[in-house]
Interface confidence: low
């Protein structure tokens, strides 16, 4: 028998520094978790102590904090190199700054293989990117070899900016020939490492012949055996065992997100490369694990540039940006309009000539807007200003919802109107009219939404049975502020970009902004 220890991370999203328990900014260091310095301590302890160790990342290192905004992926390459990762799969967010924003800072700088078997380059990009990422890699581990084959969500063109010269194929179709190739090379221990979400991970385990272990990401899935050590509720046992179509027991793992846990999976193989046993658990990287002093010193050195950046001007406003609770929790506010416009702009993807864009709608809980920005400071807007407006470190995500779910959400928005509660929705690509004289649950009298399958966008009545794409804060996607119907009824959920980053990018692009209150939200006469 031969033992392999797989250490794995996924969806780290730029959490290079330690964070609070909810993965936002660390406030009380004695209660903080994660970060690359602490991760390094644990990884080194395990490497020193166990003979055959692989450290793998299943994608989405990019995007999530000011670290990515400023360093644009150079920080990912630098610190992953320092931690001596053995391999990484490409996630959808690795394409957020386009293909160039992946090639230059990461692909060319990484000292470890970066993998995806289902991304095929074409046209002039094919020669430029050749060899910079691979479908698979054979890694020597002790006196054995292990094959790692990568995969990436085929939805990436809708979620990020990979451009037109990368084709995202079906994961299972693309993986099988690469696994077959590994078998012909006498590699009999194969890990599928990728970023397509837990449901696809399970399908790969079931359908791809020859895959022994699946290490996944994208869905931020937390698996645990026994009593979980923090707030995350397990979606199943760790590892999650899938019976493949050819009768093998295939362990599937994921390690939540944000570098809060280090996935720890021990696999025992027989001499033919069959998995005899698999077991483990994610390790909570809490303050009982010290931060490595040398990595911490490096983090502090890199931090200096971030502090300078946060006070630099991103753009200007020539109007007062009303983010007050007196406005945003009661009526349409121009800060809400600005944020929603930025959210839609961040999701412009011309992937189909029948559609001007794949998504036109935004909703945003008014309670998530925490501060106004005064234009009388020379109009200057800084990252620091935006951090006061959006202090929670959330993401703006893409969901698919039925029209009937959206209708319920808008009824919830005003079900207890007038009490300055956070659920009042700000919008983009939506015109809503409320009649507050009607009873709660029946106050939405008009709900029109901007078409997507049209050359000239216009507003049409919401159809209850139609499926719509909507951009919204992850807080709402997870049922926050009482929007349980969104959590329970959503048909798809893909996590998006850091909220502040979305708005800052938009402001930088526009240079000068002047959002207005323009009749997106109305109250029918006599009721308000």
């Amino acid at each position: 028998a031969w033992e392999l220890t797989i250490l794995h991370t996924n969806d780290v999203h730029s959490r290079l520094e330690q964070t609070s328990e909810d993965s936002s900014k660390c406030v009380n260091a004695s209660r903080c978790m994660g970060g690359v310095a602490r991760l390094f301590t644990k990884v080194q302890q395990i490497r020193r102590a166990e003979p055959n160790v692989l450290l793998l990342d299943a994608g989405d290192q990019y995007q999530g904090t000011i670290w990515f905004t400023v360093y644009k992926g150079a920080e990912v390459a630098h610190f992953m190199n320092a931690l001596r990762y053995d391999a990484m799969a490409l996630g959808n967010h690795e394409f957020d700054n386009g293909v160039e924003g992946l090639i230059e800072p990461l692909l060319k700088e990484a000292k470890f293989p970066i993998l995806s078997a289902n991304i095929k380059a074409k046209g002039p990009l094919a020669s430029q990117i050749s060899g910079l990422y691979l479908p698979y890699k054979v890694l020597p581990v002790g006196d054995e070899v292990v094959g790692i084959v990568g995969y990436t969500s085929k939805e990436t063109p809708f979620l990020s900016n990979p451009g037109t010269n990368l084709v995202f194929e079906d994961e299972i179709t693309a993986l099988q020939p690469e696994v077959d190739k590994l078998k012909t090379l006498n590699v009999n221990k194969i890990i599928a490492l990728g970023h397509s979400g837990f449901e696809m991970d399970k399908l790969i385990a079931q359908k791809v012949r020859g895959v022994d272990v699946v290490v996944g990401g994208h869905s931020n899935t937390f698996l645990y055996t026994g009593n979980p050590p923090s707030k995350e509720v397990p979606a199943g046992k760790y590892p999650f065992i899938v019976t493949s179509d050819d009768g093998r027991k295939v362990p599937v793992v994921q390690a939540y997100a944000f570098g809060k846990y280090l996935g720890y999976l021990k696999i025992e193989f027989d001499e033919r490369g069959n998995v005899i046993s698999s077991h483990g658990n994610p390790i909570l990287l809490n303050s009982s694990i010290p931060e490595d002093p040398s990595i911490k010193a490096d983090i502090n050195k890199w931090r200096i540039k971030l502090d300078n950046y946060s006070t630099q001007e991103l753009g200007k406003t020539i109007v007062y940006l009303d983010g007050s609770s007196q406005s945003c929790r009661f009526r349409e506010c121009n800060m809400g309009n600005l944020i929603c416009d930025a959210m839609i702009n961040n999701n412009l993807r011309h992937t189909d000539e029948m559609f001007w864009n794949h998504v036109s709608m935004c909703i945003l809980n008014g309670g998530g807007i925490r501060s106004p920005i005064d234009e009388r400071n020379n109009g200057t807007i800084t990252w620091e200003n935006l951090a006061a407006v959006l202090p929670f470190g959330g993401t703006f995500d893409l969901v698919q919802l039925k029209g009937s779910t959206l209708k319920k959400a808008f009824e919830h928005s005003v079900h207890r109107y007038g009490q300055s509660t956070g659920e009042f929705l700000q919008v983009g690509g939506i015109h809503v009219v409320y009649d507050l004289s009607r009873k709660p649950g029946d106050r939405v009298v008009k709900l029109d939404v901007l078409c997507t399958k049209c050359r000239v966008p216009s507003y049409d009545p919401l159809k209850m049975d139609e499926v719509y794409k909507v951009i919204l804060p992850n807080f709402l996607a997870n049922g926050g502020d009482g929007f349980q119907m969104i959590k329970d009824e959503l048909l798809r959920h893909d996590s998006g970009d850091q909220d502040i980053n979305v708005v800052s990018t938009y402001i930088s692009k526009m240079k000068v902004i002047y959002p207005a209150v323009e009749g997106r939200i109305k109250f029918s006469t006599g009721s308000h």
């Epitope: 028998a1 033992e3 644990k42 302890q45 395990i46 020193r48 102590a49 166990e50 003979p51 002790g142 055996t225 026994g226 009593n227 050590p229 046992k237 760790y238 720890y264 021990k266 025992e268 046993s277 698999s278 077991h279 483990g280 658990n281 390790i283």
Partner: antibody
């Protein structure tokens, strides 16, 4: 402080079985391995096998595969080793010891249970 | 199975002495070696893991070294409480195997 609690002694008849316990309070039981080690009087240490409390996955020394069966009860944070078809060769002190993430050093040991096989 | 050999089964030394206990493996074990101390009352403690890393709470007079197949444990300044039997153990491959032990006595 991690303490593994084992009963002091067991007296059993030849041919019978005995189930030894190892109670492990004071830490997340399901995140670690429990190892079992045999020591015959005046002899050295011999690794019998181990069990991962989180999933009941186990490894055995081939020599003990038909002799020992390892189990856990997570509700009571207790590991068990059943020894079957006992002979005088099985008279020994049996230790349980914890190992876990990041080092397979047996970091914490029980006091050991002395098993005497005698008619 | 990997055989672990401690050629010296017993060793006599004086208080304050520097004592070295050796251990060899039947094949290379890439530093995957631990040292344990067993007191006369049967109590067992981990002293050193991964050849040279001191387990928490273990006095700094204990140190370990070695590579490949040959390893050693050194006690730099022998104290009365160090009277015990010392075992090496490899964890490079299953099954885990121990050396036969070296019993340390006071002259």
């Amino acid at each position: 402080q991690v303490q593994l609690q084992q009963p002091g002694a067991e007296l059993v008849k030849p041919g019978a079985s005995v189930k030894l316990s190892c109670k492990a309070p004071g830490y997340t039981f399901t995140s670690y391995w429990i190892n079992w080690v045999k020591q015959r009087p005046g002899q050295g240490l011999e690794w019998i096998g181990n069990i991962y409390a989180g999933s009941s996955s186990s490894n055995y020394n081939e020599k003990f595969k038909s002799k020992a069966t390892l189990t856990v009860d997570t509700s009571s944070s207790t590991a068990y080793m059943q020894l079957s078809s006992l002979t005088s060769d099985d008279s020994a002190v049996y230790y349980c010891a914890r190992s876990g993430h990041g080092y397979d050093g047996f970091a914490y040991w029980g006091q050991g249970t002395l098993v005497t096989v005698s008619a | 199975d990997i055989q672990m050999t401690q050629t010296t089964s017993s060793l006599s030394a004086s208080l304050g002495d520097r004592v070295t206990i050796s251990c060899s493996a039947s094949q290379g074990i890439s530093n995957y070696l631990n040292w344990y101390q067993q007191k006369p009352d049967g109590t067992v403690k981990l002293l050193i893991y991964y050849t040279s890393s001191l387990h928490s709470g273990v006095p700094s007079r204990f140190s370990g070294s070695g590579s490949g197949t040959d390893y050693s444990l050194t006690i730099s300044n022998l104290e009365p409480e160090d009277i015990a039997t010392y075992y090496c153990q490899q964890y490079s491959k299953l099954p885990r195997t121990f050396g036969g032990g070296t019993k340390l006595e006071i002259k």
